[in-house]
């Protein structure tokens, strides 16, 4: 039989964007495999990613059942083949993850400007409502469906000819701003959840500039 002992997983890390949630850990396995379990604070341990040699496990299916719950995962290490185990009295080696509350911690993905429409001195900018893997009644919910008014968007906009930025905020997915007629503007948006203490802001959307064949223009 082998002499390489099994080792416990370490550096358990949650990677989550728009509720797509993956647990990652180290080390790359040598003569061992992993099984992951996930639980809510009050719930039972559910095994996932059985006997895997991967060092990540997609737990999205479990956390989307209730994104406001707090989850804990643990990674078990089992010897592969005829390798001795270091677990005492037959107890398997495992390591716990940090707690993870999807609603409070999932990263908000980079928003996308869906379209803009100019009418005289008014410019309407619409942010695409990203879909998540959270389901209700067999349909996938959008970020807005999940976060409601907790989610706001900040619009940064400026004249193409200058660098002075202005900002606007909305708790819907639309901005209606005053602009100078005949001027071209550039803008980007950022998603923000002001009530959060971590992961409050998304990265900025790609910059869009008027006159670059995006959206609909009306004089």
């Amino acid at each position: 039989s082998g002499t390489t002992n099994t080792v416990a997983a370490y550096n358990l890390t949650w990677k989550s964007t728009n509720f797509k949630t993956i647990l990652e850990w180290e080390p790359k396995p040598v003569n061992q495999v992993y099984t992951v379990q996930i639980s809510t604070k009050s719930g039972d341990w559910k095994s996932k990613c059985f006997y895997t040699t991967d060092t990540e496990c997609d737990l999205t299916d479990e956390i989307v059942k209730d994104v406001k719950q707090t989850y804990l995962a643990r990674v078990f290490s089992y010897p592969a083949g005829n390798v001795e185990s270091t677990g005492s009295a037959g107890e398997p080696l495992y390591e716990n993850s940090p707690e993870f509350t999807p609603y409070l911690e999932t990263n908000i993905g980079q928003p996308v400007i869906q379209k803009y429409e100019q009418g005289g001195t008014k410019l309407k900018v619409t942010v695409k409502d990203s879909f998540t893997l959270v389901r209700r009644n067999n349909t996938f919910l959008s970020l807005r469906d999940v976060f409601g008014k907790d989610l706001i968007y900040t619009l940064y906009y400026w004249k193409s000819s200058s660098s002075g930025k202005k900002t606007a905020k909305t708790n819907t997915n639309e901005f209606l701003i005053d602009v100078d007629k005949g001027e071209n503007y550039c803008f980007s948006v950022q998603a923000v959840i002001p009530s959060r203490t971590v992961n409050r802001k998304s990265t900025d959307s790609p910059v869009e500039c008027m006159g670059q064949e995006k959206g609909e223009f009306r004089e």
Epitope: V33, T35, Q37, D44, W45, K46, S47, F50, Y51, T53, F76, Y78, A80, G81, P92
Partner: antibody, heavy 121, light 107 residues
């Protein structure tokens, strides 16, 4: 159709080894775990271990650690289970069983017909 | 190892009867439990996976449910072809373990 065909019955002496084969057909061999389960005469089912055909990684029940070796030959879509240092209590029917899809990853949805191994002096 | 205590070990019922078998796990196994049917001289056959999901092609008279660490397997109306031994199996913890089996006979 999907099936697992096992090798024939074996009679072995105590202390010897036995190697049972299980040939898979009708599905993508590498995509499903394969398990070995045994059943002593008139007794219940006992899980022995698992092999991942795509990488050949194995995990065994502690009871069989050091005595069992599971291997696979991807060219023939065949898995093997070798049990050494046989004793009379190893007399049993040995089954290979396919692990189910990701939905039911550790449910055994397809079984071989079984191989009777008799250990007798 | 997780112990799966299956009861009764045997039962006798009439055709058309409702038959219930229980399996109790020695600790919480979530819904990671499967049920199998084994007829004499044959390999087992998967009937129910994840406690309550019917395997494709299995008659709807078979069903499964869970309450905590207690799992129930039900045949709503026993048929002659249901004469077999039934096993539960947990896969939430290594090693995978089976219940001791329940032999179902016709009265």
């Amino acid at each position: 159709q999907v099936q697992l065909v096992q090798s024939g019955a074996e009679v072995k002496k105590p202390g010897a080894s036995v190697k049972v084969s299980c040939k898979a057909s009708g599905y993508t061999f590498a995509n499903y775990y394969m398990h070995w389960v045994r059943q002593a005469p008139g007794q219940g089912l006992e899980w022995m271990g698992i092999i991942n055909p795509s990488g050949g990684i194995t995990v065994y029940a502690q009871k069989f650690q050091g005595r069992v070796t599971m291997t696979r030959d991807t060219s023939t879509s065949t898995v093997y289970m070798e049990l050494s240092s046989l004793r009379s209590e190893d007399t049993a029917v040995y089954y290979c069983a396919r692990g189910g899809s990701k939905v039911a990853a550790l449910a055994f949805d397809i079984w071989g017909q079984g191989t009777m191994v008799t250990v007798s002096s | 190892d997780i112990q799966m205590t299956q009861s009764p070990s045997s039962l006798s019922a009439s055709v058309g009867d409702r038959v219930t078998i229980t399996c109790q796990a020695s600790q919480d196994i979530s819904n990671s439990l499967n049920w199998y049917q084994q007829k004499p001289g044959k390999a087992p056959k998967l009937l129910i996976y994840d406690a309550s999901n019917l395997e494709t092609g299995v008659p709807s008279r078979f069903s499964g449910s869970r309450s905590g660490t207690d799992f129930t397997f039900t045949i709503s109306s026993l048929q002659p072809e249901d004469i077999a031994t039934y096993y539960c199996q947990q896969y939430n913890f290594h090693p995978l373990t089976f219940g001791g089996g329940t032999k179902v006979e016709i009265k």
